[in-house]
Each structure stands twice: as C-alpha cells, then as structure tokens.
C-alpha cells in the first residue's frame, strides 16, 4: 500500500504566440480545480475507462476574475497535494490523466457550473520511494507544470511497496530469514500472508489477509474456475479434450462450513452462516475479538471484548461486509441523473454532467443548452442564460464548427517544424534543441537547460525531468 502524490506547480498559457483567453471574466468569476486518474501499466485506454489505480480531486483554488485587457496569467491554484492512495502493489509503470476543471461562480441555476478546461495524459515508469519527478504537459494553448512521486505507507517498503516492515524487537538484528528494511534499517521485514484458505494454486495476495485470483479463477478463495462462454455448465474442472467446464461438485457439496455452520450457494461461490462464537469464511475461526484486528480497510472494531461475544466492524465510506472486506461500488447505484458520468473518488462521489445539465447529481436541466448542440465533441456549458461551447482539442468557434490549425500560432521554437496531429501538435526540433516545443537548448557538455526546481525542492536535490 502507498500513496501517489501530485503537486501542481502552475497552469497557464504556454509559450509562444496565440495565448489563450482567460477562462474567467468579471461577469463570470471562476476558480480552478484538478482531477487525477491513474491506471496501472502503459495503458492506451480511453479517458473514461476506470481509474484502476485510483483517482483524486483537488480542493478549489482561489476565486479569479480576469482584469479587462490583461493577458491570461498563470491562474491561482488550489493549495496542497493531490493524493491517490493505492491498496495493492505499486505497478512501476502507470498511465495518468490530469484534468483542469473550471468552476464558474455566476448565479447559475442549481449552483456552480463545471467545465473541463484542459486534459493532459501520459505514460511513465516510476519506482516507489524515489525522488519527485518533474513534468511539463501542454493541452492546446495551456501549459501544466507538475511533479509527482509514489511513496509506500508503513509497513510497506520497496520499489513496489510489496515488502512489509515492522519495528525490530531486539536492537541487534532481525530474526532468522528476516531482512532489515532499507532504508528503514531499524525495522525488520514482516511476512505477508494471504487469507486462510486462499488457493495455493490459483490465489495470491499483496495485502495481508486478502486473496486475489490468477486468470481463469474466481471466488473468495480462488477455487472456482471461471466459466468459458462456449460451455453451458458454470462449474467444475476443465475438460482436457474440449476446453469446456464439465459439471463438477457444487460449492456446498460436502458442507465446507465447519463448527455447525450452514452453507448456501452464491452466484460465485458459497457463504457460511456461522453459529455464535464462530467466524470466518468457513466458520473455522473461534473466539475472534477486536484484539485480533478483524476489521479491514480502516474499519473500527467495537465489542468482542471476550471470545463469546461477537465484534462489529464499523466500516469507513466505500467499504462494507462484516469485516469491511468488500469495496462498495457506489457508482453501481447510478446516482448521476440525466446520463451523467459517475466518478468514485474514494472519499466522495462526483458526477460529470452531460451538456445541458448541472448540479451535484446532474439533476438540474439547463434550458439554455437544450437543443443547442456543440459540434465535434464540444461540451455545451450553461452561462448566465446563454449557451457556450467548450470545444475539444483542434476545434474552435461559437459552436466548435471551425477547425483550429494547432500549427497556425507557430508554436515550435528555434526553427522547429510543426506537424498537426490528431491529439494536438508535434514539434520536430532543429539540431541543438529539445523539448515538447523545442524550447530547451542542448548544451555542448550534454546537459540541457531545464526549468527551475519545484517548490520544496532545492536546486541540488535529485529530480527527474520527463
């Protein structure tokens, strides 16, 4: 387990001519906030695919009102880091999406209107526990500067946060077979053990007490083969000749529930109803108390002071089950109305509303967008009684019908050649220059002129520029 941390340093106009208009005005003051979405691996998935590693939303930035006639400056930012906790191992390679959102503070019906101002995405390699990595990304005429890192939460350590450490019991050395935990040399590695009963063939874990299934297996203990679509029977071992699943014993056959528990089949496996004083998947555990730490995912244990009395886990938001072991998919309840996109950010739900709707659950119909379509993927934004379009990359105009030439503003510095690309533009730099816009000269000694260190980093600190 650990935390991915993102520090936004600046969001404002990119270099070169064609500076964007300020997103806020005297009539429509606004403030910015950011959303980060993380996915494991070097995925090329669509922006709307699940943020499997996690997502986070920043606080709102200070209210900003454009000064008439002034160019858009770097916009005021929210305080603090965006933090995305991850429960499992850090994958090492990941994809990110960072969205800059504008919250308009005019007197809209149903509260403030949100619109997406810019979206940047990338794929990176990053070891947990390393220094801050620095990045610059551009979306249209906007430029976003940020740093990020992944760090493990104790007791996890290592580049993937898969090793567990615990304080040494003796000052001299760790027990047999247990290594000191670099860089925490005063701590010792602790064993990681999966949930009791997790199949040794088909299950593994990256958190104590969990059971994750290898491909082709399912169920709480990874003992149930996944059905193949070409076969009728959902159970049993695979037939070597057909590759299909042949009928096998049911999950309750032979009653897997110990100590007088009663078994009932579930769609994916079985469930035991245990008599008083027994707990666990198969009622195999007796006398569990709060001292045994039975509540997962930060659940609060109450009662159970003596082995004969049951404990109760009070689960934090987002988790349920008798031991808070199940993650709640709060979006499955479809809380966003009118076709809004549901975002489960862990600490809160957010609805991203379709054009023409607003409100925390997209419950407000904004009439001024009704029947007024924005072309080429643009989003209609309610704006004080008049419809406006927030256009997708590469388009402009009132209704996003005008194709914008991303190279028209000559964005490539130092003689770099500009090529229009479906996702924006690409610069081919002249010899001796580098960077997304050819803005950095390559020094003869091999170093490059790079931007200054982010706040909190001294120039001498180790850092990485991507």
């Amino acid at each position: 387990a650990g935390v991915f941390e993102l520090q936004i340093h600046s969001f404002g106009p990119g270099p070169g001519p064609g500076a964007p208009r300020s997103p806020c005005s005297a009539r429509l003051p606004c403030r910015l906030f950011f959303r980060v979405c993380l996915k494991p691996g070097l995925s090329e998935e669509a922006a709307e695919s699940p943020c499997a590693l996690g997502a986070a939303l920043s606080a709102r930035g200070p209210v900003y009102t454009e000064q008439p006639g002034a160019p858009a400056p770097d916009l005021p930012l929210p305080d603090g880091l965006l933090q995305v906790p991850f429960r499992d191992a850090w994958p090492g390679t990941f994809s990110f999406i960072i969205e800059t959102w504008r919250e308009e503070l005019g007197d809209q019906i149903g509260g403030p209107a949100w619109s997406l101002l810019a979206r940047v995405a990338g794929r990176r390699r990053l070891a947990a526990g390393g220094p801050w990595a620095r990045d610059i990304q551009r979306a249209g005429a906007w430029e976003l500067r940020f740093s990020y890192r992944a760090r493990c939460e104790p007791p996890a350590v290592g580049t993937a946060c898969t090793r567990l450490c615990r304080p040494r019991s003796a000052p001299s050395r760790c027990g047999p077979g247990l290594r000191p935990c670099a860089p925490l040399e005063d701590e010792c590695e602790a064993p990681l053990v999966c949930r009791a009963g997790c199949s040794p063939e088909h299950g593994f874990c990256e958190q104590p007490g969990e059971c994750r299934c290898l491909e082709g297996w399912t169920g709480p203990l990874c003992t149930v083969p996944v059905s193949t679509s070409s076969c009728l029977s959902p159970r049993g071992p695979s037939s070597a000749t057909t590759g299909c699943l042949v009928p096998g014993p049911g999950p309750c056959d032979g009653n897997p529930c110990a100590n007088g528990g009663s078994c009932s089949e579930t769609p994916r496996s079985f469930e035991c109803t245990c008599p008083r004083g027994f707990y666990g998947l198969r009622c195999e555990v007796s006398g569990v108390t709060c001292a045994d730490g039975p509540c997962f995912n930060g659940g609060l244990c109450v009662g159970g002071a003596d082995p004969d009395s049951a404990y109760i886990c009070h689960c934090p938001p987002g988790f349920q089950g008798s031991n808070c072991e199940k993650r709640v998919d709060r979006c499955s309840l479809q809380p966003c109305r009118n076709g809004g996109l549901c975002l489960d950010l862990g600490h809160a739900l957010r609805c991203r509303c379709r054009a023409g709707f607003a409100g925390p659950r997209c419950e407000h119909d904004l009439d001024d967008c009704a029947g007024r379509a924005c072309a080429n993927g643009g989003t209609c934004v309610e704006g004080g009684g008049a419809h406006r379009c927030s256009c997708a990359l590469g388009f402009g105009g009132r209704d996003c019908r005008e194709r914008a030439d991303p190279c028209a503003a000559r964005p490539c510095a130092h003689g770099g050649r500009c090529y229009a690309h479906f996702s924006g533009l690409v610069c081919a730099c002249a010899p001796g220059y580098m960077g997304a816009r050819c803005e950095f000269p390559v020094h003869p000694d091999g170093a490059s002129a790079l931007p200054a260190a982010p706040p909190g980093l001294r120039p001498g600190d180790p850092q990485r520029y991507l």
């Epitope: 191992a89 290592g158 993937a160 898969t162 090793r163 027990g175 047999p176 077979g177 247990l178 590695e189 064993p191 990681l192 053990v193 999966c194 009791a196 009963g197 997790c198 199949s199 040794p200 063939e201 088909h202 299950g203 593994f204 874990c205 990256e206 104590p208 994750r212 290898l214 491909e215 110990a258 195999e284």
Partner: antibody
Framework: QITLKESGPTLVKPTQTLTLTCTFS??????????VGWIRQPPGKALEWLAL???????RYSPSLQTRLTITKDTPKNQVVLTMTNMDPVDTATYYC????????????WGRGTLVTVSS | EIVLTQSPATLSLSPGERATLSCRAS??????LAWYQQKPGQAPRLLIY???YRATGIPARFSGSGSGTDFTLTISSLEPEDFAVYYC?????????FGQGTRLEIK
C-alpha cells in the same frame, strides 16, 4: 497443463559451483503473483527449502544457505536458475523446483527432481 | 526460525484403519500449515493447506485440523496407495520450514 523440470549436472566435485535450471510451461513469470522456488532433499532425509523468486524479481533465501545461493529468472525462456557455491558432500540431494504464489508460501506444483551427488 | 516436529517418526497400520499424524510448531503459526505426501522416487504432493483445506484432487478421506502450534492430519480409512512419507510445512514466517516427516508403512 503446468509442468516443471529440473536440469543440471548429476555429479559435482567439492568446492565447485552447482548450477541448476528449472524449465517450466503452462504459466509465465511475468504474471503478477507467480513465483518459482527450489527445495532439496538429501537421501532418506527431510525436505529443505532453499530459495524463491517472484514475478517482481523479489528473491527469498534460506538464512542458513543465503551466502551460497543465487536465484535468477529468465522470463522469456520460462526458466529459473539456482547457483550454489562451494559444494560439499553434505549437499548431495535431490533438488526440486516448484511453483509458489506470492503471499501463499506453499508449493502446489512440483518438478520430478534431479539428484546431484557431490563427490571427488 | 520455526521448528516443526512430526510424530510419530513411523506409523505402522493396515489398510482400512484410521491414521492420525501430528505436527507441532515451536511457536504459533496460526492456521498457516500444509501437509504433503511423498511416495518413493516421486516429488511431494500438496494434500492439505491452511490446516484443513484440501488441495485440488485430494480424496475426502484426507482431513486436517488444528491451529496455533498443534496440527493433525487424519486419513479416515487407509487405502494401499496412502502408504508414504508425510511432511508438514508452515507459511507464517520466514524462513519456510518443513517437518522431518512421518513414514506411514503397512503393518
């Protein structure tokens, strides 16, 4: 179907280094959660765990033999290699490789084993 | 390291009888204990894991019980193919260790 097969020399001289290879099929060490380990068994004696390596290159060694053992993997070749330095006649044993999943430190699937004799 | 002590060293029984094998840990291993069966010239085979869960394809006559430091493998009615050496192994801590084995032989 998962199979594991050990290969290497059958006879090693004292002080020499033993190199054993486990070649497996039916799974990949690029799969998250998967590992391969080595266990040995002197003739007529008990099993002794030696080393483990996992998909994320995490390596575990028996503390009593840690200074003599090195375990590595060649993921594209579906192979795990164990080297054991400074061999001694007491290291005469059948050496097995077996699959073990991360956090689930049992050995569900085994190779047939290879007998290594240490003698001058 | 955790030491696993198996008893008896040798158990002589006849087919159809009930066999009870013991494994004792030098400190608690919770329920994280497995049993393996090994026949002459063959690799060990996982029978029971986490004290009482039967591995894939293991007949119902094999059962396990116990937790903490004392564990038992029971074979309810011995078949001729059950005569072999049985080992216990824990997974609760590093290093992984095995017991010294119990030989189950035909009386």
């Amino acid at each position: 179907q998962i199979t594991l097969k050990e290969s290497g020399p059958t006879l090693v001289k004292p002080t020499q280094t033993l190199t054993l290879t486990c070649t497996f099929s039916g799974f990949s060490l690029s799969t998250r959660g998967v590992g391969v380990g080595w266990i040995r068994q002197p003739p007529g004696k008990a099993l002794e765990w030696l080393a483990l390596i996992y998909w994320n290159d995490d390596k575990r060694y028996s503390p009593s033999l840690q200074t003599r053992l090195t375990i590595t993997k060649d993921t594209p070749k579906n192979q795990v290699v164990l080297t054991m330095t400074n061999m001694d006649p007491v290291d005469t044993a059948t050496y097995y490789c077996a699959r073990s999943n991360w956090g689930n430190w049992y050995f569900a699937l085994w190779g047939r084993g290879t007998l290594v004799t240490v003698s001058s | 390291e955790i030491v696993l002590t198996q008893s008896p060293a040798t158990l002589s029984l006849s087919p159809g009888e009930r066999a009870t094998l013991s494994c004792r840990a030098s400190q608690s291993v919770s329920s994280y204990l497995a049993w393996y069966q090994q026949k002459p010239g063959q690799a060990p085979r996982l029978l029971i894991y986490d004290a009482f869960y039967r591995a894939t394809g293991i007949p119902a006559r094999f059962s396990g019980s116990g937790s903490g430091t004392d564990f038992t493998l029971t074979i309810s009615s011995l078949e001729p193919e059950d005569f072999a050496v049985y080992y216990c192994q824990h997974r609760s801590n590093w290093p992984i260790t095995f017991g010294q084995g119990t030989r189950l032989e035909i009386k």
